[in-house]
């Protein structure tokens, strides 16, 4: 942004009114009057150049300084060709000097060069000569120099004339501020710039209207710099929740809009399944039956908890019962979906029932199922089992409602053989084993395993589809570990108990007796 | 009916050696594994060991966390097994007591291992403290 | 080792069905069989090879053993059934006695 410029003294607009002091008085520089363009124009002019060692000063008017800390000085002004004169005037000079002193009150003619300091050496980039002149065409020349920084209530300008043949056209004395602006929502004031060229003055904004500084982010601030311009900005406002940029400022979003923080986004439309909302909303509500999780985006439509599973299957296996089901028809909207299976056991006989989570296995843990299958393994004989898969999403937790389906399984897996020694000699074991009526026709052969007790390492398998078996070609007087299983088209029945049977020592009698 | 009647000191010294006797009377005593259990105060069972005297030999089974410092014998002249645990420490303060199972081990070729313990004795509370 | 693990506590109302699981790896091949243990006294014999009670015992006692859980049933119950309870097997990988944690019945 452009400079502002503050303008102290101004000898052009003051009309010939200021009333300069001259010293010495009544010699060297003079006030003149000119006509251009049908308008008086005043200037101050020396031109003793044949005299020789002229010192000849004009002060401006004492100057307040106000705020100003640094002051630019423009000059306009004219200068002779010494050669325009004749013999080339020895003692002729083509520059002259500018001087300034502060001081705290106007010394009114008390004049001393002593208190004045010199500021340089004002040299022409353009001399006049003598052709220019006599065709009234005189070539003006603009310096501006600057003096800083200044601490006294007021002060003086003065010009030096040492020989030259000056016309002093305009004297215009200004300093400069940093104008007020508006960036990135911030509001910088009006600020004086600063007196040393090096150094910039940091100045604070503030946000406008329904604008804040985004959390973790920096606070507005711009630097001033010597020429007053704005320089080098840090931080920044955005919009505050509720409000969006339009140009420089903030503005409530509209009915049906939302914005759920400070930041640069517009305004959002309200996401399905909300309530319009009223003006400058920082979010929109759910209708009723939907709801937003704690982590959804306000941006995200609101959702609602799934229907049950679609279809649910129990497919009995023996002591296991595999669950299958189809995701729910309605997801509520949402992709998060998991289910948790739920286990109840009634006894047949005195229609009791309870939770069964602590006697049977599931093949992976049965809450936060993300697959839409689990096994569920060592089911009891002849128990009533329902199964329940409650389907739930991220907003289940929302409401009191629970969306589910339940499916019923009796387990008829065959009862564990009841297995018995029927006879023993010192290398065999003879063993039979029964299982209730209704259940052999489903039994397609028995397996029976036995190995050395205390022999763990390894162990022997006979497959008949008989109820007896005849082990052969054992150790005497050594006890074996016998086990006997169902085998049915569903898989394996469940097993026996683990017998101990002991056959006979060499000096045992009787081959076979029990 | 068969009666368990068990006896010993009571109070020991880190490092000294426990010494229990349990003494049968009104049963059989070969074919049974007769056994040691223990129970720490205010916390559940644990079995020490079991021994069976069959003919002139002695069939010993020890809890494998135990079983460098447990010894049980038998005198099958007074009826007795005895249970002697060495080294003891604050943790093996517990009440002490002898079992009889259910069924002698073998009947006819059919085994019981681990069977249930339907005679217990009163019970010795050994406590450890220096 | 083979390990047997019991609920630490049960709760029931007077005249109501209490059961006590235990559970173990293929519990249901072995013989289980559970005691009850009263404060300062010995524990005693309630059930035994699953499901058989010794004499003396009340018919209100039963067992049951499949799978990977046997289960203690105490029907009716009253205040006098207030004790610590006990499963125990025998487990034929390492030849020794194991017993459960025990269970705390309260009668409410």
């Known amino acids: 942004a452009q400079g502002k410029e503050v303008v102290l003294l101004d000898f052009a607009a003051a009309g010939g009114e200021l009333g300069w002091l001259t010293h010495p008085y009544g010699k060297g520089w003079d006030l003149m009057q000119n006509i251009m363009n049908d308008m008086p124009i005043y200037m101050y002019s020396v031109c003793n150049v044949m005299s020789g060692d002229q010192d000849n000063w004009l002060r401006t008017n004492w100057v307040y300084r106000g705020e100003a800390e640094r002051i630019f000085i423009e000059l306009k002004f004219t200068v002779r060709d010494c050669n325009s004169f004749p013999g080339g005037a020895s003692s002729c000079k083509e520059t002259f000097n500018l001087y300034y002193a502060e001081s705290d009150l106007d010394y009114g003619t008390n004049f001393q060069k002593r208190l004045f300091t010199k500021i340089d050496t004002i040299a022409p980039d353009e001399i006049t000569v003598s052709s220019d002149f006599e065709a009234r065409h005189v070539k003006l020349n603009v310096e501006e120099r600057s003096v800083g920084p200044l601490t006294r209530k007021g002060f003086y300008l003065a010009f030096q004339d040492i020989g030259a043949c000056v016309a002093l056209l305009s004297v215009r004395v200004y300093y400069k501020k940093c104008p007020e602006l508006l960036q990135g929502l911030a509001h910088f004031p009006e600020t004086i710039a600063g007196s040393d060229a090096p150094s910039l003055a940091t100045v604070a904004g503030t946000c406008v209207d329904h604008a804040v500084v985004p959390p973790g982010g920096e606070e507005p601030r711009m630097h001033c710099a010597v020429d007053g311009e704005w320089l080098v900005p840090i931080g920044q406002c955005l919009c505050q929740a509720g409000y969006e940029k339009v140009e420089d400022a903030c503005q409530a979003c509209s009915p049906g809009f939302f914005k759920f923080e400070a930041s640069e986004s517009p305004c959002l439309e309200c996401p399905e399944h909300t309530l319009p909302s009223p003006e400058g909303a920082t979010s929109c509500e759910c209708e009723e039956g939907f709801f937003r999780a704690p982590q959804d985006p306000a941006s995200m439509p609101c959702t609602r908890p799934p229907s049950a599973p679609h279809y649910l299957t129990a497919v009995g296996m023996g002591a296991k019962v595999e669950l299958r089901w189809t995701p729910p028809q309605d997801s509520g909207g949402r992709e998060d979906i998991v289910y948790s299976v739920t286990c109840e056991q009634c006894w047949p006989e005195s229609g009791e029932c309870g939770p069964c989570e602590a006697s049977v296995r599931y093949s992976e843990p049965p809450h936060g199922l993300t697959r839409t299958s689990v096994t569920v393994s060592d089911l009891e004989p002849h128990m009533n089992y329902t199964f329940t898969v409650e389907a739930r999403n991220g907003v289940s937790g929302l409401v009191t409602s629970r969306s589910f389906r339940t499916a019923s399984v009796s387990i008829n897996q065959t009862e564990p053989p009841k297995v018995r020694l029927e006879g023993r000699s010192t290398t065999s074991l003879s063993v039979s084993w029964s299982i209730p009526p209704p259940q052999q026709s489903r039994v397609w052969k028995y397996e029976v395993t036995y190995r050395k007790k205390g022999d763990s390492n390894s162990y022997n398998v006979r497959r008949t589809e008989g109820f007896s078996v005849t082990l052969d070609d054992l150790a005497p007087d050594t006890t074996y570990l016998v086990q006997v299983q169902a085998l049915t088209q569903e898989g394996q029945g469940a097993g026996s108990k683990v017998h101990e049977f002991q056959t006979l020592s060499p000096e045992g009698s009787g081959n076979l007796a029990v | 009916q068969v009666q368990l009647q068990q006896w010993g000191a009571g109070l020991l010294k880190p490092s000294e050696t426990l010494s229990l006797t349990c003494a049968v009377y009104?049963?059989?005593?070969?074919?049974?594994?007769w056994s040691w259990i223990r129970q720490p105060p205010g916390k559940g069972l644990e079995w020490i060991g079991e021994i069976n005297h069959r003919g002139s030999i002695n069939y010993n089974n020890y809890n494998p966390s135990l079983k460098s410092r447990v010894t049980i014998s038998v005198d099958t002249s007074k009826n007795q097994f005895s249970l002697k645990l060495s080294s003891v420490t604050a943790a093996d303060t517990a009440v002490y007591y002898c079992?009889?199972?259910?069924?002698?081990?073998?009947?006819?070729?059919?085994?019981?291992?681990?069977?249930?313990?339907?005679?217990w004795g009163q019970g010795t509370m050994v406590t450890v403290a220096s | 080792s083979y390990v047997l693990t019991q609920p630490p506590s049960v709760s029931v109302a007077p005249g109501q069905t209490a059961r006590i699981t235990c559970r173990g790896n293929?519990?249901?091949?072995?013989?289980v069989h559970w005691y009850q243990q009263k404060p300062g006294q010995a524990p005693v014999l309630v059930v035994y090879?699953?499901?058989d009670r010794p004499s003396g015992i009340p018919e209100q006692f039963s067992g049951s053993n499949s799978g990977n859980t046997a289960t203690l049933t105490i029907s009716r119950v009253e205040a006098g059934d207030e004790a610590d309870y006990y499963c125990q097997v025998w487990d034929h990988s390492s030849d020794h006695v194991v017993f459960g944690g025990g269970t705390k019945l309260t009668v409410l």
């Open positions: 079992a009889k199972p259910l069924r002698p081990h073998c009947t006819n070729g059919v085994c019981y291992s681990g069977d249930a313990f339907d005679i």
């Open positions: 009104g049963g059989s005593f070969s074919g049974y594994y």
């Open positions: 293929n519990i249901g091949s072995k013989n």
């Open positions: 090879d699953d499901s």
